[in-house]
């Protein structure tokens, strides 16, 4: 079953290559187990950036080597992606799945265009 997911259209990464955005979903029921996946669409390909499954009311847990961190509050997930460089500019899509209890619901946001600008190297000081 389909579910509506909202996310901002555009986000600019900061000078340290970190970008944050909120992914909000319209839950049709009382889900206790939710899976959030961040996908990146670029060059006619979709790749998975990171994913986390969490129990409602608990923290999101990404893998140790993940470039993503996040927190949840109700039907909102605050996502942060770190270590971005200019070549990582692209459309980042939030996919939310209500895993338990049944029925299964899935929603996909319209994507957040994340722009990353590599910082200029500091000039050598004499």
């Amino acid at each position: 079953k389909a579910m509506h997911v909202a996310q901002p259209a555009v986000v600019l990464a900061n000078s340290r290559g970190t970008a944050s955005f909120v992914c909000e979903y319209a839950s049709p029921g009382k889900a206790t187990e939710v899976r959030v996946t961040v996908l990146r669409q670029a060059d006619s390909q979709v790749t998975e950036v990171c994913a986390a499954t969490y129990m409602m009311g608990n923290e999101l847990t990404f893998l140790d080597d993940s470039i993503c961190t996040g927190t949840s509050s109700g039907n909102q997930v605050n996502l942060t992606i770190q270590g971005l460089r200019a070549m990582d500019t692209g459309l980042y899509i939030c996919k939310v799945e209500l895993m338990y209890p049944p029925p299964y619901y899935m929603g996909i946001g319209n994507g957040t265009q994340i722009y990353v600008i590599d910082p200029e190297p500091c000039p050598d000081s004499d």
Epitope: A2, S44, Q45, V46, I108, G109, N110, G111
Partner: nanobody, 126 residues
Framework: QVQLVESGGGLVQPGGSLRLSCEAS????????IGWFRQAPGKEREEVSC????????NYADSVKGRFTVSRDNSRNSVILQMNSLKPEDTGVYYC???????????????????WGQGTQVTVSS
Amino acid sequence: QVQLVESGGGLVQPGGSLRLSCEASGGTLDYWSIGWFRQAPGKEREEVSCISGTGLRTNYADSVKGRFTVSRDNSRNSVILQMNSLKPEDTGVYYCTGKLLHPSLWSACANEYDLWGQGTQVTVSS
């Protein structure tokens, strides 16, 4: 650059079955809208089936409804067209087509396609 490759065609008797596969080389078909077209000798190319990027929506031409089934096999990075109760009028070259739409359209079939495979011949004859 992604390329589409069809396989599974051949000669089959009326009432028989074939399983066509559309695979991607040089990339993945994740979240791509995939269509199946066929062209019979002396006839125009027609779309027989499509499946949305999420796999939640499928469409079929009236002539194949109830006989053909399209599905995604993400583990093998392919889209399958299962053709049952084949008729002589199903004879033709079958083409796999694909397009990666904006995420807002991942639940829909594409209106037009960017990528075409080389086709696989299906002949239904006794």
